[in-house]
Interface confidence: medium
């Protein structure tokens, strides 16, 4: 399950990664020296029935549709880390890999 | 960061964790010989800002709100196995680990 | 090819200011990937990171050398320089300027390549 | 600021000689340790990054192994070209630290 790419002019409403750069000198974040900005991606989109579910649960789940379960969403299924370049707590300067920053495939769980 | 727990009689309106037994038979599935039921859980609850977020990411594609990004949902952060005993496709009958079955954690992604 | 080269005067007295300069060509020093350092050897020694600053200014520098340590960066001239204040003969080195490299993926970094051709300063009255 | 402790500072070889240097760390500084090579006269170049990758168009007969305190670089054949001093750098947590050096010369 590769999930399905795509960009701003695309006219899929399913679950999709989108692209998307981050800038940290936008937000302000001034304790990020390296990257300034990194391509991240997003996930958006609709969860049709069967649509790109990730795990046998999500399936479950809408068979035995609990109280309050919402349905599956479109969200990060697999992802990456990036080498970042940041002050920590003790303020000092560290290279260091960061999981969880790089969104690889979207699905829907 | 291990998720909050929940059950049918909690007050808790963010994300969490609910017992759910999914019954096979129930669903008419006879094809899974054994277990016949089993505790799956479920994720359920609103993603406030920066709520229960798994990954670093999630909260950068809030502060950069991309078009079309729906916010964080409530979902399965981590999941594990069950062993089944289950026909296949081929009509043999399989003992095998099932992933992505029981949710173990629910957060915000 | 990013190419650096580097001008200031090889002889200062001390106490006073050396000052160099590293120009960059075949690249912006605005890339928004790239870090600009200075790096001195002080002979028959080892290599010593001065400190590293970013098109936008933001510097930062080895805590050894910080009271004394200015690097700032001209967008226009396409240049970045060193300024090391009240030298003495220990300040005596070659001096070498030199770019960071950070990928926008965040999987590649290349600390210090490429260098400028260096820069031999002696502090000497 | 990590120490960067380098061995041997010097050491005599002869061509197709087999030369390993170590660098050892004051802490654990993960595999974030480069190589670089150097020649009288010349900017250093470097040889290997993340203590273990060859930089694109250096020779397979450099490689470098090691992580948290303790690293090494290995010629597996020295040629000629190769007679220079060789230098470690940390890249974990600023300051960056070099080693102090291990000149390469010919027996």
């Known amino acids: 399950n590769l999930g399905l790419d795509c960009d701003e002019h695309s006219s899929e409403s399913r679950c999709c990664r989108y692209p998307l750069t981050v800038d940290f000198e936008a937000f302000g974040w001034d304790w990020i020296i390296a990257p300034k900005r990194y391509k991240a991606n997003y996930c958006s989109g609709q969860c049709e029935y069967m649509f790109m579910q990730k795990y046998p649960h999500t399936h479950l789940v809408q068979q035995a549709n609990p109280r309050g379960s919402a349905g599956p969403c479109c969200t990060p299924t697999k992802m990456s880390p990036i080498n970042m370049l940041y002050f920590n707590d003790k303020q000092q300067i560290i290279y260091g890999k960061i999981p969880g920053m790089v969104v690889d495939r979207c699905g829907c769980s | 960061n291990l998720g909050l727990d929940c059950d049918e009689h909690s007050s808790e309106s963010r994300c969490c964790r609910y017992p759910l037994t999914v019954d096979f038979e129930a669903f008419g599935w006879d094809w899974i010989i054994a277990p016949k039921r089993y505790k799956a859980n479920y994720c359920s609850g609103q993603c406030e800002y920066m709520f229960m977020q798994k990954y670093p990411h999630t909260h950068l594609v809030q502060q950069a709100n991309p078009r079309g990004s729906a916010g964080p949902c409530c979902t399965p952060t981590k999941m594990s196995p069950i062993n089944m005993l289950y026909f296949n496709d081929k009509q043999q009958i399989i003992y095998g680990k099932i992933p992505g079955m029981v949710v173990d954690r629910c957060g915000c992604s | 090819e990013v190419q650096l080269v580097q001008l200031g005067p090889g002889l200062v007295k001390p106490s006073e200011t050396l000052s160099l300069t590293c120009t960059v060509s075949?690249?912006?020093?605005?890339?928004?990937?790239?870090?600009w350092g200075w790096i001195r050897q002080p002979p028959g020694k080892g290599l010593e990171w001065i400190g590293t600053?970013?098109?936008?200014?933001?510097?930062y520098y080895n805590p050894s050398l910080k009271s004394r340590v200015t690097i700032s960066v001209d967008t226009s001239k396409n240049q970045f320089s060193l300024k090391l204040s009240s030298v003495t003969a220990a300040d005596t080195a070659v001096y070498y300027c030199?770019?960071?490299?950070?990928?926008?993926?965040?999987?590649?970094?290349?600390?210090?390549?490429?260098w400028g051709q260096g820069t031999t300063v002696t502090v000497s009255s | 600021a990590i120490q960067m402790t380098q061995s041997p500072s010097s050491l005599s070889a002869s061509v197709g000689d087999r030369v390993t240097i170590t660098c050892r760390a004051s802490?654990?500084?993960?595999?974030?340790l480069g190589w670089y090579q150097q020649k009288p006269g010349k900017a250093p170049k470097r040889l290997i990054y993340?203590?273990?990758s060859l930089q694109s168009g250096v020779p397979s007969r450099f490689s470098g192994s090691g992580s948290g305190t303790e690293f090494s670089l290995t010629l597996s054949s020295l040629q000629p070209e190769d007679f220079a001093t060789y230098f470690c750098?940390?890249?974990?947590?600023?300051?960056?630290?070099f080693g102090q050096g291990t000149k390469v010369e010919i027996k």
């Open positions: 802490q654990d500084i993960r595999n974030d």
């Open positions: 993340a203590a273990s």
């Open positions: 075949g690249g912006s020093i605005s890339n928004s990937n790239y870090y």
């Open positions: 750098l940390q890249h974990h947590i600023y300051p960056w630290t």
């Open positions: 030199a770019r960071d490299y950070y990928d926008s993926s965040g999987y590649y970094y290349n600390w210090f390549d490429p």
């Open positions: 600053t970013y098109y936008s200014g933001t510097t």
